[in-house]
Interface confidence: low
């Protein structure tokens, strides 16, 4: 981006996406959190939000900071899911 990436601004804005996603996931019973088809619309909305917020502050998306934030959200909601039950891609360094 011409004006450069405002990483601080992005880290301030991304939690808004996380909160909106958490609010939506509150409608999904916890035992369904490993079934992506139950909340795919919410998840797509979340990823679109992170992309938009990154772009607003002049950052490319995806980027390491945004992916780190998304990984944190994955941990919060999907840490108990086996790989074959939820198909969400974490950054390569998250094994």
């Amino acid at each position: 981006r011409a004006g450069g990436c405002n990483e601080t601004g992005m880290l301030e804005r991304l939690p808004l996406c996380g909160k909106a996603f958490a609010d939506m996931m509150g409608k999904v019973d916890v035992w369904k959190w490993c079934n992506l088809s139950e909340f795919i619309v919410y998840y797509e909305s979340f990823t679109n939000c992170t992309e938009m917020e990154a772009n607003v502050v002049g950052c490319y998306w995806p980027n390491p900071l945004a992916q780190g934030f998304i990984t944190g959200i994955h941990r919060q909601f999907f840490s108990n899911c086996t790989v074959d039950r939820v198909h969400l891609e974490d950054p390569p360094d998250e094994v």
Epitope: A22, D23, M24, M25, G26, K27, D29, V30, W31, E38
Partner: antibody, heavy 115, light 111 residues
């Protein structure tokens, strides 16, 4: 061990406001929904409302206008506040973990509304 | 409004027999599977038996089973035991959360 316990009920007068607190242990309110259910003496179960893991609240249509469910995730408590009590609100009130898969219940507390 | 009509209100069964309890919903439950079954004994809180129409809750004997779809649901107790004497309730959740409701209950008497 996952447990819930409702605060003590007791005797209330018509028009009073009921405040019940559910204290949970062994699980996080940030992960699980918490539901309130009541049961009038000799009657069936009645869904009052719930608070989702996100903090969103949901109420039965009959309870919406006079019920408020709040939570304190730091203290692991959920509070049900019900205004304008009448004799019809006499019941055992239960808090329970979950929304439809409600699989951990408190023992219940008896609330009596009488003049 | 979401109304769960549960039948029968009372049923008697012999030990080893089969009991079938029905719940008819006035509208489709949320995601077509937000339907649970509970057992309650006097002086105790309810106990979850079945969730998502047919999934057996952990620790519940497999003589309990749930079935159904759309607006019609059934709880079956096969090989009834004395310990199964209780009142059973269905619970349906809907798109509009304010419609979430229990059925009226079915008392099961074991002879």
């Amino acid at each position: 061990q996952e447990q819930l316990e409702e605060s003590e009920g007791g005797l209330f007068k018509p028009t009073d406001t009921l405040t019940l607190t559910c204290t949970v242990s062994g699980f996080s309110l940030s992960v699980y929904a918490l539901t309130w259910v009541r049961q009038a003496p000799g009657n069936g179960l009645e869904w009052i409302g719930a608070i989702g893991n996100s903090g969103n609240t949901y109420y039965a249509s009959w309870a919406k206008s006079r019920s408020t469910i709040t939570r304190n995730t730091n203290e692991n408590t959920v509070t049900l506040k019900m205004t304008s009590l009448t004799a019809a609100d006499t019941a055992t009130y239960f808090c329970a973990r979950g929304y439809v898969r409600i699989n951990v219940w408190g023992p219940g507390t008896l609330v009596t509304v009488s003049s | 409004d979401g109304v769960m009509t549960q039948t029968p209100s009372s049923v008697s069964a012999a030990v080893g027999g089969t009991v079938t309890i029905s719940c008819q919903s006035s509208q489709s439950v949320y995601k077509n599977n937000y339907l649970s079954w509970f057992q309650q004994k006097p002086g105790q809180p309810p106990k979850l038996l079945i969730y998502e129409i047919s999934k057996l809750e952990s620790g519940v004997p497999d003589r309990f089973s749930g079935s159904g779809s759309g607006t019609q649901f059934t709880l079956t107790i096969s090989g009834v035991q004395c310990d199964d004497a209780a009142t059973y309730y269905c619970l349906g959740g809907y798109d509009d959360d304010s419609d979430t409701s229990f059925g009226g209950g079915t008392e099961v008497v074991v002879k």
